[in-house]
């Protein structure tokens, strides 16, 4: 049986598949900051995970996925506050015992080093130096993320 | 009309604790953070911290962190400040202050400030 | 925690003149810096966001500019409405913090 911060994320996710496709992001939109091939948007106030979950989507957008160790680092040094945590898009699913992204996909445990338990309503939160496991009620700020698309040049056929 | 409405003067004693209120009207209570300032000598503005009125999650300048407790009562949408042991260094006007977007750090709607005077 | 220095405790100008007050970031602030005004026994109102998007309904003889450190709010042509103090705000960290103000008094 699915927690219901798992069905939140499920729900997003199959709601983000349905959409009709957008055109490519080829810029990040004013307020957000560039990443490499994503766009990032740092929140000003605190909410539970599944509040940050839903406040992302509300931009058109999903709390941030880490791809690996360095795309991390590079996260880690645009945070400026030592002391704040930032909720991202990876939560424990009671069901398949393991960290699960909000696009579906599981942790490669090597991608990072978190610190606490996990267990059934714990969620990761990234500080400027670690990541942590915290309850997902505690009220923290969060990432949001667009993907930028690559500019692929388009042939066109003869009219 | 976007409004947030703060409670009245207070001139308490030394050592005393006290309570300003600030009651939104015109627009989602929930939807917006609050959040609360200081003035001093009719100038110096201080951040004191926020409130997210959703949820109750409050983040607070450290300096402020033993000073100032915030919360908010949904039903009335009414939030508060309380604010400890007070001295004659806390004597200021104290502002409720809106947070404008969830993503940046502007304040777009302001109460009109409550005077305080911590004074024997 | 960040200091936001502006310079000019009191500016004098008159009405129609062009006005700069600056503002200075200790350090980097991008350009998350918002501008208030404050006109007498008023709270403070935002005038510009984002270091130079006016906000909605603020006459467009405000207007603000820099990134990094040195920020300056212009007003085109001073009106005598004008008269308030003008404060800096930056939030490029969570502790946000403001500028000392600056008095614009009409000659």
């Known amino acids: 049986q699915k927690s219901s911060i798992e069905k939140c994320s499920v729900d997003i996710q199959q709601s983000r598949n349905k959409t009709t496709e957008r055109p490519g992001l080829l810029n990040c939109p004013i307020y957000w900051q560039q990443l490499r091939e994503k766009c990032l948007l740092f929140s000003h106030t605190v909410n539970p995970w599944n509040n940050s979950l839903a406040d992302c989507s509300t931009k058109e957008s999903s709390l941030l996925l880490i791809r690996d160790k360095d795309e991390l680092i590079h996260t880690q040094n645009l945070i400026r506050d030592k002391a704040i945590l930032f909720w991202i898009g990876l939560n424990f699913s009671l069901s398949e015992k393991n960290w699960k992204w909000i696009n579906g996909s599981f942790l490669n445990s090597n991608d990072l080093e978190i610190r606490g338990d996990a267990k059934e309503n714990s969620c990761i939160s990234i500080s400027q130096t670690s990541v942590y496991s915290e309850y997902c009620s505690t009220e923290i700020r969060w990432i949001c993320q667009k993907e930028l698309t690559p500019v692929r040049n388009k042939v066109y056929p003869d009219s | 009309e976007v409004q947030l409405q703060q409670s009245g003067p207070e001139l308490v004693k030394p050592g005393a604790s006290m309570k300003i209120s600030c009651k939104a009207s015109g627009y989602s209570f929930t939807g917006y953070t609050m959040n609360w300032v200081k003035q001093s000598h009719g100038k110096n503005l201080e951040w004191i911290g926020l409130i997210n009125p959703n949820t109750g999650g409050t983040y607070y300048n450290q300096k402020f962190k033993d000073k100032a407790t915030l919360t908010v009562d949904k039903s009335s949408s009414t939030a508060y400040m309380e604010l400890l042991s007070l001295t004659s260094e806390d004597s200021a006007v104290y502002y409720c202050?809106?947070?404008?977007?969830?993503?940046?750090?502007?304040?777009?709607?302001w109460g009109q400030g409550t005077t305080l005077t911590v004074s024997s | 925690d960040i200091v936001m220095t502006q310079s000019h405790k009191f500016m004098s100008t008159s009405v129609g003149d062009r006005v700069n007050i600056t503002c200075k970031a200790s350090?980097?602030?991008?350009?998350?810096v918002v501008w208030y005004q404050q006109t007498p026994g008023q709270s403070p109102k935002v005038l510009i966001d984002?270091?130079?998007i006016r906000h909605t309904g603020v006459p467009d003889r405000f207007t603000g500019s820099g990134s990094g450190t040195d920020f300056t709010l212009t007003i085109s042509s001073v009106q005598s409405e004008d008269l308030a103090d003008y404060f800096c705000q930056q939030y490029s960290t969570y502790l946000y913090t403001f500028g000392g103000g600056t008095k614009l008094e009409i000659k």
């Open positions: 350090q980097d602030v991008g350009t998350a």
């Open positions: 984002w270091a130079s």
């Open positions: 202050a809106r947070l404008g977007d969830n993503y940046r750090g502007y304040f777009d709607v």
